[in-house]
Interface confidence: low
Amino acid sequence: YFGKLESKLSVIRNLNDQVLFIDQGNRPLFEDMTDSDCRDNAPRTIFIISMYKDSQPRGMAVTISVKCEKISTLSCENKIISFKEMNPPDNIKDTKSDIIFFQRSVPGHDNKMQFESSSYEGYFLACEKERDLFKLILKKEDELGDRSIMFTVQNED
């Protein structure tokens, strides 16, 4: 069971300092952006991270949403990352959900995060290059020191 707490607005970057944004096709991508680029591309670069209390404490449970025309929420259904047109719900009556991720910070670095899927244990949000695009994907963590699953989260509010 997950119960919604507060939400915050955040900019999410990978460890190469590329900014996560939603492109016109609603795809989550990373791109090099200056701070002014990041502002100019808002709200596509501003993510709503909603925190949830978890009946089985396993780390901070969160959803990641974006509000362009409508609110879309990140989902990892079938291990495929996509934004689904939906508000983060107030309650989720299950111990797993495709939209809930466990956010954990690196010790001593509260802004450096990893996001583990609540549906697929051991699978993390990651940045992966595919041709010329840097995509947000769900990836099974199977190697130590994997930079691709680490992100910085900068609060905007």
């Epitope: 963590e141 130590l144 020191g145």
Partner: antibody
Framework: QVQLVQSGAEVKKPGSSVKVSCKAS????????ISWVRQAPGQGLEWMGG????????NYAQKFQGRVTITADESTSTAYMELSSLRSEDTAVYYC?????????????WGQGTLVTVSS | DIQMTQSPSSLSASVGDRVTITCRAS??????LNWYQQKPGKAPKLLIY???TLQSGVPSRFSGSGSGTDFTLTISSLQPEDFATYYC?????????FGQGTKVEIK
């Protein structure tokens, strides 16, 4: 092949400090964590703290907070552990170990150990 | 802090025996558990990580199982080189902790 080579044995007086080094070779240094684990004679393993060189800041077990300092020099791929205000109970073998910083945090490579003896 | 309790603290066994060591966490740690082997005067060696994944180069007679709070390390057929001390380690929290160890001795 990854190797962690530690500095040699030390004999120290109570109240003094000791600094042990751990030089990594054969693999990426910055994107892994380096932890320090100690083992008193005839006792079990005790995690002291660790550092992720790429991020810089260390974190420590509560027991050692304020008395241990862990640092890393990326240019030489070397991690350091300094323990201050030494007492006889700090006599132990000190190991460095390479770990991750993602969801899984296991130590796949270890240094050979450095014996620190605290005696007046 | 999460406490790890290993049992037994020591055991005597013969070559060829099946040996089981258990490790219990004070709260659920999912599969965030590792097993190490240590011989006198040597550094620990990683055997199993993520609860049940065999580290490369470790003989298949070693296996790990369990999830949540209860975990087991099994040696299916004890060999002379397996006489050593075995430690579990949790890393559900960044502040990782080890069990107190299980010494496997020759009967």
């Amino acid at each position: 092949q990854v190797q962690l080579v530690q500095s040699g044995a030390e004999v120290k007086k109570p109240g003094s400090s000791v600094k042990v080094s751990c030089k990594a070779s054969g693999g990426t240094f910055s994107t892994f964590s380096i932890s320090w684990v100690r083992q008193a004679p005839g006792q079990g393993l005790e995690w002291m703290g660790g550092i992720i060189p790429i991020f810089g800041t260390a974190n420590y077990a509560q027991k050692f907070q304020g008395r241990v300092t862990i640092t890393a020099d990326e240019s030489t791929s070397t991690a350091y552990m300094e323990l201050s205000s030494l007492r006889s109970e700090d006599t132990a073998v000190y190991y460095c170990a390479r770990g991750g910083y993602g969801g899984y945090y296991y130590f796949d490579y270890w240094g050979q150990g450095t014996l620190v003896t605290v005696s007046s | 802090d999460i406490q790890m309790t290993q049992s037994p603290s020591s055991l005597s066994a013969s070559v060829g025996d099946r040996v089981t060591i258990t490790c219990r966490a004070s709260q659920s740690i999912s599969n965030r558990l590792n097993w190490y082997q240590q011989k006198p005067g040597k550094a620990p060696k990683l055997l199993i990580y993520k609860g049940s994944t065999l580290q490369s180069g470790v003989p298949s007679r070693f296996s790990g199982s369990g999830s949540g709070t209860d975990f087991t390390l099994t040696i299916s057929s004890l060999q002379p080189e397996d006489f050593a001390t075995y430690y579990c380690q949790q890393h559900y929290q960044w502040l990782t902790t080890f069990g107190q160890g299980t010494k496997v001795e020759i009967k």
